[in-house]
Amino acid sequence: KELKVTQPEKSVSVAAGDSTVLNCTLTSLLPVGPIKWYRGVGQSRLLIYSFTGEHFPRVTNVSDATKRNNMDFSIRISNVTPEDAGTYYCVKFQKGPSEPDTEIQSGGGTEVYVLAKPS
């Protein structure tokens, strides 16, 4: 099956202090390689979460990514702050014959708007 990375929501709004889910699904796990979430694009993009076992504060996977046929790479960001605002991209990599892995496809991006906490 041809690989496609889908981020269904173009944008989400979340109140500061709340949690939000950023959805991402794949149509294929091949070629093998990691899936990572970034905020922003280009050289200045920031790694938000990687499905490779590391711990990321405030960010967790939504589905059980240890399922060998898992195609859902959605994440939950907890206790959102204004600094979390921006556009988030779900990115599929192909393992490299040597470091680093090669980015092969990105989702369309989901913009996160952080609303002031109601007083």
């Epitope: 091949l30 093998v32 060998r68």
Partner: antibody, heavy 118, light 107 residues
Amino acid sequence: DVQLVESGGAVVRPGESLRLSCAASGFTFSSYAMSWVRQAPGKGLEWLAGISAGGSDTYYIDSVKGRFTISRDNSENSLYLQMNSLTAEDTAVYYCARETWNHLFDYWGLGTLVTVSS
Amino acid sequence: ALTQPASVSANPGETVKITCSGGDWYSTYYGWYQQKSPGSAPVTVIHSDDKRPSDIPSRFSGSASGSAATLTITGVRVEDEAVYYCAGYDGRTYINTFGAGTTLTVL
């Protein structure tokens, strides 16, 4: 420190059943997929079965499908292998192993010996 | 099936390469496991093609290209004498496979 301790190995007769256990400690067990691997006397390593972190998905090598069942109890930090209709070919040391994100192995138990003999 | 040489030998200080072929680079990740005696617990020396656990000496390294993976031991030591198993995880079939093992003798 990550620790995996297998138990339940025994001498059994052909056709009998046995349940192996693996007690895990030193890591968040419920976050990791796990596998069982065996080694018959004088032979190499053979992967048998794997299970997802939540326990809903299981995977088996063809030769044990239908006879062996992998399961886990995350509240007890334990992994299990139920083995039915055992034959002499199942005689081996059985290891539990923690899986990496891409379903290879990073930590192994010391193993438990299963002997099937009449 | 994954294929690796039955045995290799080297003098202390030499560089040893053990190859493992038969996987598909598009769908396979490789790992390497050291077993010092039959029935003893294997030790992971490389996983994810080239990732070395923190407690494994830096003389062990791994790589994968095409349909093969390679374990390299740079400056081999007597204590590295063991059987080394390669393993692959196939993302097409969701199955793990081991090679038959390579006995490393340090002369």
